[in-house]
């Protein structure tokens, strides 16, 4: 049997026998274009493609539409994988989305959506989510039904304001909504009563800016 040399996601890499977490090269569906991603091969059976990570504020997340489309940051640290790749990938097969969160008091929680996909750029990478479970709130902190993606230079929210400019970061803003994992990073003891922090309302409430976040996807049939 011929060895697979290109992989569309970290689940394929895991199944090929490469089971160590780290940076791997993925290939866009139906293309030769490549992208580097962090693969988490440890959490919940492995095979997770990390699409977002925050941990220390080292990367500026107040970026343009083009940057969110193509991705930015470093897969070894803070980064955004890229809306275009995620849209193409999740449009091919059914994926689950796991969001892992850490607060400043040493607590961890997660939200798991049993079906996740992003629409194409023509639909502003609108997010679609169903089937929430997990410990980070019984109500989805990503507004339902899903919103279009907005950035500082592309305002697609439902607010009379420009949420991305007001709150910082690109996100699926509603008006503006109960979450923003791409908000301004605030250090410990400066992370409460924040209007533009890293927010997941149905876990930590209003104004609390989180210490670390990871968004990762995996095929539902993994």
């Amino acid at each position: 049997k011929e060895e697979q040399t290109t992989f569309r996601d970290c689940a394929e890499i895991f199944k090929s026998g490469l089971t160590t977490s780290g940076i791997y090269t993925l290939t866009f569906p139906n293309s030769t274009e490549e992208i580097k991603a962090y693969c988490d091969m440890d959490v919940g059976g492995g095979g997770w493609t990390v699409i977002q990570h925050r941990e220390d504020g080292s990367v500026d997340f107040q970026r343009t539409w083009k940057e969110y489309k193509e991705g930015f940051g470093s897969p070894l640290g803070e980064y955004w994988l890229g809306n275009e790749f995620v849209s193409q990938l999740t449009g091919q097969h059914r994926y689950v989305l796991k969001i892992q969160l850490k607060d400043w008091e040493g607590n961890e929680a997660h939200s798991l959506y049993d079906h996740f996909y992003l629409a194409g750029e023509e639909s502003n990478y609108r997010i679609h989510l169903t089937g929430l479970t997990g410990t980070a709130g019984k109500i989805s902190s990503i507004s339902q039904p899903g919103s279009d993606f907005s950035t500082k230079d592309s305002d697609n929210d439902k607010c009379i304001c420009k949420c991305s400019q007001m709150l910082s970061g690109g996100w699926w803003f509603d008006a503006c909504g109960p979450s923003n994992l791409n908000g301004q990073y605030y250090p410990q003891k400066q992370n409460t009563n924040k209007f533009n922090g890293i927010k997941w309302y149905y876990w930590k409430g209003s104004g609390y800016s989180l210490k670390a976040t990871t968004m990762m996807i995996r095929p539902a049939d993994f």
Partner: nanobody, 129 residues
Framework: EVQLVESGGGLVQPGGSLRLSCAAS????????IGWFRQAPGKEREGVSA????????YYADSVKGRFTISSDNSKNTVYLQMNSLRPEDTAVYYC??????????????????????WGQGTLVTVSS
């Protein structure tokens, strides 16, 4: 640093009055809406009243209409809640909270709870004879 400090709570007899104050610092009231919320033991936090646009727009929950009055003094960066004809069911911890005034959904007048990102520590109001 954004801070909200409530004061004015206390014990009052049914039918009595209290005036709560919410002193804001770290931002100016001109660009923000301030809401008053309350939470009774074992119950959800509920919106009581809110104000924005230098008092040009105000909101009251049905349960307090005609009894409570919200006002602001922007020179003191303080919002007040005058509570008259108090009832035992008004007993709760009262909180003030802030939200950027522009964070409004098209066609809506007021804000969901999760949009209020800055909160005070609360002041206890007890209505009892």
């Amino acid at each position: 640093e954004v801070q909200l400090v409530e004061s004015g709570g206390g014990l009052v007899q049914p039918g009595g009055s209290l005036r709560l104050s919410c002193a804001a610092s770290g931002f100016t009231l001109d660009d923000y809406a301030i809401g008053w919320f309350r939470q009774a033991p074992g119950k959800e936090r509920e919106g009581v009243s809110a104000i924005r646009d230098n008092g040009g727009s105000t909101y009251y929950a049905d349960s307090v209409k005609g009894r409570f009055t919200i006002s602001s003094d922007n020179s003191k960066n303080t919002v007040y809640l005058q509570m008259n004809s108090l009832r035992p069911e008004d007993t709760a911890v009262y909180y003030c909270a802030a939200v950027p005034a522009g964070r409004l959904r098209f066609g809506e007048q007021w804000y969901p709870l999760y949009e209020y990102d800055a909160w005070g520590q609360g002041t206890l109001v007890t209505v009892s004879s």
